[in-house]
Interface confidence: medium
């Protein structure tokens, strides 16, 4: 067990051009507060996934009113640390989200209105018991400077808070076989209470004789790495060939703890460690009131008169979740018709329409030929959301502006020779063939398969294609 501590040093405009306007003004005084969300591991997780390691909300900072004409300074911050208690071992690697919130006061609103100013996120490695780590993160034009550390709560010590320490029984040295508890010189490592053979790196215990595994490890002594890639079945016994062990169903499967609570198995069932503001067997009861500003992203908080009546957040468009913390993927509903590209801008949806379509949802099929001229006598043909020109003989291209080589497609059959002509093409047919494209054989007796040739043209003469 232990506590993750976050100290915000400053929040203000970052370096470089485009300094942000102050979030507060004489007409709209405001104050800041912060929210931190911690998740185990280094996985890339969506911002709205549960804060499995815990979350905390800071106190409100002092009320700040911008002086007219002054640039946005570092804004006054809440006093004290943000503390996120963790009950189990410290995972060593973690992801964080730190949100800066503005509480508006005064004449624009009749009570506080909350809006998210900046959100920074990162993934870090951190050993418990180490010194403060300093960090600078930027979100748009804002810059957040902060420090953080993880410390173990006695009697736990070590980089994962899994070793237990006890005060020395003798003033000079620890008992037989027991080491001093660095850096606590006056304490000794407690006698081994975990199950014999429990991995000191990957296992820990809170009760004598037990061996509980850190994330990524399994087996009775926490010596077997969990391999998701080589396990064929989602659940099953140990495989001697793959070295893969997937635990059987446990009471914490699927995490029965709501609202970001962390689950730990007990001999009979499970126990939830709830983040601040929640309680109950499954962290399902909220002790937070509207005064705590639980509704994010501009949600309207409606709460009962006593702490036991849960508040309700009425979320604005684009957000959902019990605290309006989840952004709705409104594009998943495929609102854009006719192949339009959907863009969720947060405050609104936009559809980028394909050629030939228009309207807020690309629902209007434009008259593709409206205002489209086909040159050189070509005619416009509508279809498929894009206009097409059917070009007059001798012209081609999208708008019939290109002069075509009429012989390029080899239109004269049976070895006839093609000649480009001002009005199109002329085929000079090989002996034995006739027709505009030399497509008709001439019968051996001299009769044609067609009616008699027009006057002045003998079979075998070049046939002009008019």
């Amino acid at each position: 067990a232990g506590v993750f501590e976050l100290q915000i040093h400053s929040f203000g405009p970052g370096p470089g051009p485009g300094a942000p306007r102050s979030p507060c003004s004489a007409r709209l005084p405001c104050r800041l507060f912060f929210r931190v969300c911690l998740k185990p591991g280094l996985s890339e997780e969506a911002a709205e996934s549960p804060c499995a390691l815990g979350a905390a909300l800071s106190a409100r900072g002092p009320v700040y009113t911008e002086q007219p004409g002054a640039p946005a300074p570092d804004l006054p911050l809440p006093d004290g640390l943000l503390q996120v208690p963790f009950r189990d071992a410290w995972p060593g690697t973690f992801s964080f989200i730190i949100e800066t919130w503005r509480e508006e006061l005064g004449d624009q609103i009749g009570g506080p209105a909350w809006s998210l100013l900046a959100r920074v996120a990162g993934r870090r490695r951190l050993a418990a018991g180490g010194p403060w780590a300093r960090d600078i993160q930027r979100a748009g034009a804002w810059e957040l400077r902060f420090s953080y550390r993880a410390r173990c709560e006695p009697p736990a010590v070590g980089t994962a808070c899994t070793r237990l320490c006890r005060p020395r029984s003798a003033p000079s040295r620890c008992g037989p076989g027991l080491r001093p508890c660095a850096p606590l010189e006056d304490e000794c490592e407690a006698p081994l209470v975990c199950r014999a053979g429990c991995s000191p790196e990957h296992g820990f215990c809170e009760q004598p004789g037990e061996c509980r595994c850190l994330e990524g490890w399994t087996g009775p002594l926490c010596t077997v790495p969990v391999s998701t890639s080589s396990c064929l079945s989602p659940r099953g016994p140990s495989s001697a060939t793959t070295g893969c062990l997937v635990p059987g169903p446990g009471p914490c499967d699927g995490n029965p703890c709501a609202n970001g609570g962390s689950c730990s198995e007990t001999p009979r069932s499970f126990e939830c460690t709830c983040p601040r503001g929640f309680y109950g067997l499954r962290c399902e009861v909220s002790g937070v009131t509207c005064a705590d500003g639980p509704c994010f992203n501009g949600g309207l908080c409606v709460g009962g008169a006593d702490p036991d009546s849960a508040y309700i957040c009425h979320c604005p468009p684009g957000f959902q979740g019990s605290n309006c913390e989840k952004r709705v993927d409104r594009c998943s509903l495929q609102p854009c018709r006719n192949g339009g590209l959907c863009l969720d801008l947060g405050h609104a949806l936009r559809c980028r329409c394909r050629a030939g379509f228009a309207g807020p949802r690309c629902e209007h099929d434009l008259d593709d030929c409206a205002g489209r001229a086909c040159a050189n006598g070509g005619t416009c043909v509508e279809g498929g959301g894009a206009h097409r020109c059917s070009c007059a003989l001798g012209f081609g291209g999208r708008d019939c502006r290109e002069r075509a080589d009429p012989c390029a497609a080899r239109p004269c059959a049976h070895g006839g020779r093609c000649y480009a002509h001002f009005s199109g093409l002329v085929c000079a047919c090989a002996p034995g063939y006739m027709g505009a494209r030399c497509e008709f054989p001439v019968h051996p007796d001299g009769a044609s398969a067609l009616p008699a040739a027009p006057p002045g043209l003998r079979p075998g003469d070049p046939q002009r294609y008019l």
Epitope: Q108, G110, G111, G298, L300, V302, G304, A305, H314, P317
Partner: antibody, heavy 121, light 106 residues
């Protein structure tokens, strides 16, 4: 201009149910919660409940649970309040009201003109 | 639920004079109180929110003050168009109106 246009007066018999409408204009209907308020005996004002047009979520005053049902029709930007099993106690003027100016304000600054409901046999 | 006790229920004053209406909440409402003017056949009109902040376009003859559970609303230099019923509204937890004060001119 932000406006709330309410339906006309109603005379209904005891035991019947009825629905009042409130047509919104001049703003994004789904962006703001719509509230309903009852004024009885020409004086007392009571908040009945609210509906979030964006997702249909509702919050009711405990006193009006089972008496009022709030709905919306997003396509016409209209909010509705259905009053059930009417008695003479339900005779009143009913207002729709909106917290509009500012960021999801929690008091009401735009009101409809009211719908008078008279319950009488 | 929070109760709002408004007094007096009616009052009469002279043109040019000053009147004060009070509202007492059953618990601390953290200055989240608004004041409305209501005339027959119309919806209530917001005058003041957050205890003392005047809405745009409302004359400075109207004012509000208070904290904790006790709040007051005043109109000075009374004019004929001020004849109406006035209500307080708490919006700290849900919404509750006071019982109203009917203002008449002597």
């Amino acid at each position: 201009e932000v406006q709330l246009q309410q339906s006309g007066p109603e005379l209904v018999k005891p035991g019947a149910s009825m629905k009042i409408s409130c047509k919104a204009s001049g703003y994004s209907f789904t962006g703001y919660t719509m509230n309903w308020v009852k004024q009885s005996h020409g004086k007392n004002l009571e908040w009945i409940g609210l509906i979030n047009p964006y997702n249909g979520g509702t919050t009711y005053n405990q006193k009006f649970k089972g008496k009022a049902t709030l709905t919306v029709d997003k396509s016409s930007s209209t909010a509705y309040m259905e009053l059930l099993s009417l008695t003479s106690e339900d005779s009143a003027v009913y207002y729709c009201a909106l917290g509009y100016y500012g960021n999801y304000r929690r008091y009401f600054d735009v009101w409809g003109a009211g719908t008078t409901v008279t319950v009488s046999s | 639920d929070i109760q709002m006790t408004q007094s007096p229920s009616s009052l009469s004053a002279s043109l040019g004079g000053k009147v004060t209406i009070t509202c007492k909440a059953s618990q601390d409402i953290k200055k989240y109180i608004a004041w409305y003017q209501h005339k027959p056949g119309k919806g209530p009109r917001l005058l003041i929110h957050y205890t003392s902040t005047l809405e745009p376009g409302i004359p400075s003859r109207f004012s509000g003050s208070g904290s904790g559970r006790d709040y007051s609303f005043s109109i000075s230099n009374l004019e004929p168009e001020d004849i109406a019923t006035y209500y307080c509204l708490q919006y700290d937890i849900l919404w509750t109106f006071g019982g109203g004060t009917k203002l008449e001119i002597k």
